[in-house]
Amino acid sequence: QPPPPPPDATCHQVRSFFQRLQPGLKWVPETPVPGSDLQVCLPKGPTCCSRKMEEKYQLTARLNMEQLLQSASMELKFLIIQNAAVFQEAFEIVVRHAKNYTNAMFKNNYPSLTPQAFEFVGEFFTDVSLYILGSDINVDDMVNELFDSLFPVIYTQLMNPGLPDSALDINECLRGARRDLKVFGNFPKLIMTQVSKSLQVTRIFLQALNLGIEVINTTDHLKFSKDCGRMLTRMWYCSYCQGLMMVKPCGGYCNVVMQGCMAGVVEIDKYWREYILSLEELVNGMYRIYDMENVLLGLFSTIHDSIQYVQKNAGKLTTTIGKLCAHSQQRQYR
Amino acid sequence: SAYYPEDLFIDKKVLKVAHVEHEETLSSRRRELIQKLKSFISFYSALPGYICSHSPVAENDTLCWNGQELVERYSQKAARNGMKNQFNLHELKMKGPEPVVSQIIDKLKHINQLLRTMSVPKGRVLDKNLDEEGFESGDCGDDEDECIGGSGDGMMKVKNQLRFLAELAYDLDVDDVPGNNQQATPKDNEISTFHN
């Protein structure tokens, strides 16, 4: 084994290095000392380190480690943060487009139903946005509310335009009749199926991205234990105490130390791998009725067809509703 | 392509969300994200090695520091000696992950379970529960991009019409069209506290 170079007789080099870490030289001995109070950089002979220096080295080592960890995860963190933001905005744009398409459909085909239809459509798409962002709203309830709200307007404006405007009494009856008589056929059910499937997947996709950010943030800001700090100090700084300023840690030694320091973090690995593969599986399935862009941007046409269905069955519906809601209508005509 | 009748749209404006290709769609962007994420699949298991390779480590030098003394880089002592009579590395490993790490592992387990239950099994294009009470699902041909509703050859085909990153925004409200939302690129500004 080659003999170690003689320690710096004056600790001058050590002082100048340490000064970069800690301005003020009062902690660095003038000449090598026995160092019997040292707890980490245990000396084999005289040393240029003091207990205070050792503590500062430990602090610096842990800080170095935290910075290295942050720089390691920077690209990954940015990738997920940027995509989470882009997708969230893109989904908002899809919802806004879908709302505008639906409003335009009403304006062009059923002008007599506006502005009430605009209001109900607006409320529906607001709920869609809130649901995507994690709000505790039931999709079936959203769709039911849309059709419950639309039907009284369709009935009073399209099917039975002779009714007076102040149709509050009959409105409640019409809302009930809408479900009991399956006024829109199976269109509400079709829309429920498509919207709930596509929004569930969209919502979990965004949740997963946001959790990805949380995972990186958690490991990014880990505080390393004192034991780890001591190991890092021994690896990176104890050589300074012997005046070995330019020497670097052995590669294998570094790996052993890092595995020790990061044993807890590495436990995430299994679940992180599973996370990425599960997210890939979800994304592969995000098409057709599992793709909110596809479903929401086509919603206006399904709603249009549902109204056409009502019109095709208008004769039978008007008769049945006339009987069912007769009491409400009589009250109004008085 | 999707059927969006022209008379539906009053205003046509260019919508840009980020600086990316014109033909990019939400689904292509999702796939691109997954491909990039997959390059980070070993991120956590590779961390120790990554940190060693990005901190001062003896590579070309004959001699290296093993925590106690200067040794030859390829000697047995290079990895072992520095650990003798030091605090026990095994002990350090046995302590288990920090509470925050355990918490995040639990959250990952939960989201993984959710992702698995939400994933569409291969081969199941549309749920057959659309068959009930008159609506029928049918098959979407493999050659089709997307389909909606209950049709086979012609469910509503939408080629992810919202080219969400550089696309015509068919907004009725002129003010509704978002402008450029450029993301800042990360700055390489970490301060290193190493001194050799």
Epitope: T302, K312, G315 | G134, I148, S151, G154, M156
Partner: antibody, heavy 119, light 107 residues
Framework: QVQLQQSGTDLARPGASVKLSCKAS????????ISWVKQRTGQGLEWIGE????????YYNEKFTGKATLTADKSSSTAYMELRSLTSEDSAVYFC????????????WGQGTALTVSS | DIQMTQSPASLSASVGETVTITCRAS??????LTWYQQKQGKSPQLLVY???TLAEGVPSRFSGSGSGTQFSLKINSLQPEDFGTYYC?????????FGTGTKLDLK
């Protein structure tokens, strides 16, 4: 002028499936529903169901749910009807017909497709 | 489902004659009734809808009447091209159903 062109005569084995087509021209395909009607030899007409080409949503006569699947392809202005698990009872002439406005009045009909189910 | 019954099932008449075909609905369908004509080996053709409105291009010798459950189609001064089978159909709601048919042939 409005035309509905149906696929030609079809012969199928019992248990098999068959897909009939109806190509529309002369009007905006997505604006009107397409219905399918069955007529057995020497018998009356039966409404099978309709497809709303705009959204691709089908609606069925309960009697034909599970037997017929209606689809539409907007790009080619074509409506399709698939009949599955064929039996001799399915031997008939099948017509496609265009809706006249928002009602079950059929103003234009295809020429019909004769389907024979025989082993 | 609403049942539609036509009478007579068949009818023989000569060119120039006037004939009336009737259709009865199993429940009140108001005026939601359509009449079609079908010739041998051909597809049906729309004649009358909403019980009495003549479809475009249909000669004025055809006329529809009735409401509720009883309807009729009257053909004045029969022409050679008028022979065939006539079907009534309600369009009161889902599912639309057709009558049993009335075959009109040359005497």
């Amino acid at each position: 002028q409005v035309q509905l062109q149906q696929s030609g005569t079809d012969l199928a084995r019992p248990g098999a499936s068959v897909k009939l087509s109806c190509k529309a021209s002369g009007y905006t395909f997505t604006s009107f529903g397409i219905s399918w009607v069955k007529q057995r030899t020497g018998q009356g007409l039966e409404w099978i169901g309709e497809i709303y080409p705009r959204s691709g949503s089908p609606y069925y006569n309960e009697k034909f749910t599970g037997k017929a699947t209606l689809t539409a392809d907007k790009s080619s202005s074509t409506a399709y009807m698939e009949l599955r698990s064929l039996t001799s009872e399915d031997s008939a002439v099948y017509f496609c017909a265009k809706d006249f406005g928002s009602s079950y009045v059929f103003d234009y009909w295809g020429q019909g497709t004769a389907l024979t189910v025989s082993s | 489902d609403i049942q539609m019954t036509q009478s007579p099932a068949s009818l023989s008449a000569s060119v120039g004659e006037t004939v009336t075909i009737t259709c009865r609905a199993s429940e009140n369908i108001y005026s939601y009734l359509t009449w079609y004509q079908q010739k041998q080996g051909k597809s049906p053709q729309l004649l009358v809808y909403n019980a009495k409105t003549l479809a475009e291009g249909v000669p004025s010798r055809f006329s529809g009447s009735g409401s509720g459950t009883q309807f009729s189609l009257k053909i004045n001064s029969l022409q050679p091209e008028d022979f065939g089978t006539y079907y009534c159909q309600h369009h009161y709601g889902t599912p639309p159903t057709f009558g049993t048919g009335t075959k009109l042939d040359l005497k």
